[in-house]
């Protein structure tokens, strides 16, 4: 039961985690940046992965796609990888654990099968949760260090001047939602693993046992000893009837005169 | 890269329009604003118009309504209608983008090379 509780319980968590990453991955607030040098309203910056907006006090909101594939930061392109390999290897690691779910019983599956695959799938959950809390952290470090801050502050471009505003970005909401979703993802895995080792079938325990009648008068009954599962009461291979048979390790080293085993 | 085009400048007489454009070009993220600022011969700088995206507009407290700023956000192209032209408004006129980068380059202010506006009987 508990087995059972841990992998479902693994499973709800990677699942939420998982979401998580890819809402993190589609939101737009990565860094955020507050304006209070604007000369006309209050504006307010924040960027994602995939598209860069601002929106001002009027609640007027317009957002601009990154322009090319090839001019992007390869810092930017990286968080990208990493938050997608997490998600596919979310995505792949939740269609697997579905089928391992105990309580799910799809033909005749052996307990041995829903073991391995809730290994796969706690692994993948790891390596995605990973994936993702990895990505978050490298964008986190983008920010800290300013990469893209150049030293001059003025200088002159086709068509006119650039000036350079020093801003201070921070980090935005998607951060804190795509640590999370890494950390849940990454502990649901972990349950996963945990819930495979009680899944794994133990090996049925059989001892060697030698009967021996007291008297002729006696007969064998069959099924009167029980084989060891390791779970049942008769733990020991105890005698259940008196007729003589005892295990290998109660047999008498001397030799008797009614032996026939 | 940013470019951003100027035109509309030229002689005009006193009381006379005139209607200045500038339009942006490159690889544009997030435009807070579009704007013009002057600077007349011996003197600083000075804003006369801004307009953010959304329609959001200040002015230059001096032009006492005689100057109109619009934008057209879908050609990234910022409009400057002059009326009432005084002598006192000759001067070069440049246009001004505040453009955000964000992560790919930070915040960053475009100007044009400027246009003359002159006003002379």
């Known amino acids: 039961m508990a087995v059972t509780a841990c992998q479902g319980l693994g499973f709800v968590v990677s699942l939420i985690g998982i979401a998580g990453i890819i809402a993190a991955t589609c939101m737009d607030q990565w860094s955020t940046q507050d304006l209070y040098n604007n000369p006309v309203t209050a504006v307010f910056n924040y960027q994602g992965l995939w598209r860069s907006c601002v929106r001002e006090s009027s609640g007027f909101t317009e957002c601009r796609g990154y322009f090319t594939l090839l001019g992007l930061p390869a810092m930017l392109q990286a968080v990208r990888a990493l938050m997608i390999v997490g998600i596919v290897l979310g995505a792949i690691g939740l269609l697997v654990s579905i089928f391992a779910l105990k309580c799910i019983r799809i033909g005749s599956m052996e307990d041995s099968a829903k073991a391995n695959m809730t290994l796969t799938s706690g692994i993948m959950f790891i390596v995605s949760g990973l994936c993702a809390i990895a990505g978050v952290s490298v964008f986190a470090n983008m920010l800290v260090t300013n990469f893209w801050m150049s030293t001059a502050n003025m200088y002159t471009g086709m068509g006119g001047m650039v000036q350079t505003v020093q801003t201070r970005y921070t980090f935005g909401a998607a951060l804190f939602v795509g640590w999370v979703a890494g950390g849940l993802t990454l502990i649901g895995g972990v349950m996963m693993c945990i819930a495979c080792r009680g899944l794994a079938p133990e090996e049925t325990n059989y001892k060697a046992v030698s009967y021996h009648a007291s008297g002729h008068s006696v007969a064998y009954k069959p099924g009167g000893f029980k084989a060891s599962t390791g779970f049942g009461s008769n733990t020991k291979n105890k005698k259940i009837y008196d007729g003589g048979a005892r295990t290998e390790d109660e047999v008498q080293s001397y030799p008797s005169k009614h032996d026939y085993v | 890269q940013v470019q951003l085009v100027e035109s509309g400048g030229g002689l005009v007489q006193p009381g006379g329009s005139l209607r200045l454009s500038c339009a942006a070009s490159g690889n544009i993220l997030s435009i807070n604003y579009m704007g013009w600022y002057r600077q007349a011969p011996g003197k600083e700088r000075e804003l006369v118009a801004i307009i953010t995206r959304g329609g959001s507009t200040t002015y230059a407290p001096s032009l006492k309504g005689r100057f109109t700023i619009s934008g057209d956000n879908a050609k990234d192209t910022v409009y400057l209608q002059m009326n009432s032209l005084q002598p006192e408004d000759t001067a070069v006129y440049y246009c001004?983008?505040?453009?955000?980068?964000?992560?790919?380059?930070?915040?960053?202010?475009?100007w044009g090379q400027g246009t003359q506006v002159t006003v002379s009987s």
């Open positions: 001004n983008f505040r453009i955000n980068f964000g992560i790919l380059g930070g915040l960053r202010d475009y």
